[in-house]
């Protein structure tokens, strides 16, 4: 999960494995102030998961979320 510092969520580790696409309802990018660029996926249970924006599955999920 992203770590909040002064209300700016940042990620210090990424999930390596793909999450089920059907479990993800939205996403957001962390702030440019964070040391690690990250995508945060929000699951249908409102859990937040940090992911590496360079990973293929992450890019694929972002594209499909943008289209839906």
């Amino acid at each position: 999960s992203p770590y909040s510092s002064d209300t700016t969520p940042c990620c210090f580790a990424y999930i390596a494995r793909p999450l089920p696409r059907a479990h993800i309802k939205e996403y957001f990018y962390t702030s440019g102030k964070c040391s690690n660029p990250a995508v945060v996926f929000v699951t249908r249970k409102n859990r937040q998961v940090c992911a590496n924006p360079e990973k293929k599955w992450v890019r694929e999920y972002i594209n499909s979320l943008e289209m839906s």
Partner: antibody, heavy 119, light 108 residues
Framework: QVQLVQSGAEVKKPGASVKVSCKVS????????MHWVRQAPGKGLEWMGG????????IYAQKFQGRVTMTEDTSTDTAYMELSSLRSEDTAVYYC????????????WGQGTTVTVSS | SYVLTQPPSVSVAPGQTARITCGGN??????VHWYQQKPGQAPVLVVY???DRPSGIPERFSGSNSGNTATLTISRVEAGDEADYYC???????????FGGGTKVTVL
């Protein structure tokens, strides 16, 4: 060192159920995603389903939906896979395998449990 | 659902290079993992994310992924490399892990 140790071989009659266990040592079960994969004699690997800790949910391969149940007992760090309404085509070696936080991919695997379905 | 196609068998002489292919529609858009399975044993991950090796896997094992084909390359093949090899991808359309049919590598 992470290790997975599975329960012993089973012989079942058609229509019965089987429950295979997978005991984890070297880490706590809820740190990792646990998956189940089977391999029929002389055939390839077939993914059956797995637990997604990030969402606290289990996903099943469509082929096994309604016939398989995967559970975890975190107090004993043991995962279970139960397959019901067995038929002869379910004769296979059943493996548990973890999907760690890093690197991606299934590793390590249990030693496998042979399930034979025969009348 | 997503289909991965592997040749059933590949034969190679010791010291030579074995190339095992895994075909799938636009597979380059997916991360491919490769497993080695020796007779009577559980599979072992040898390559993940197309081309990365887990610790303990020899540098002789390498992977690539382009277009509709991913490839596992075993250079300077040894007798101990004789095994079945499986490719695997995550299919986000079905939320399923998918395995190829496997390739038996025989060292002549």
């Amino acid at each position: 060192q992470v290790q997975l140790v599975q329960s012993g071989a089973e012989v079942k009659k058609p229509g019965a159920s089987v429950k295979v266990s997978c005991k984890v040592s070297g880490y706590t079960l809820n740190d990792f995603a646990m998956h189940w994969v089977r391999q029929a004699p002389g055939k390839g690997l077939e993914w059956m389903g797995g637990y997604v800790p990030e969402d606290g949910d289990t996903i099943y391969a469509q082929k096994f939906q309604g016939r398989v149940t995967m559970t975890e007992d975190t107090s004993t760090d043991t995962a279970y896979m139960e397959l019901s309404s067995l038929r002869s085509e379910d004769t296979a070696v059943y493996y548990c395998a973890t999907d760690p936080l890093y690197p991606p991919g299934l590793q390590p695997w249990g030693q496998g449990t042979t399930v034979t379905v025969s009348s | 659902s997503y289909v991965l196609t592997q040749p059933p068998s590949v034969s190679v002489a010791p010291g030579q290079t074995a190339r095992i292919t895994c075909g799938g529609n636009n597979i380059e858009s997916k991360s491919v993992h490769w497993y080695q399975q020796k007779p009577g044993q559980a599979p072992v991950l040898v390559v993940y994310d197309d081309s990365d090796r887990p610790s303990g896997i020899p540098e002789r094992f390498s992977g690539s992924n382009s277009g509709n084909t991913a490839t596992l390359t075993i250079s300077r093949v040894e007798a101990g490399d004789e095994a079945d090899y499986y490719c695997q991808v995550w299919d986000s359309n079905t939320d399923h892990w998918v395995f190829g049919g496997g390739t038996k590598v025989t060292v002549l």
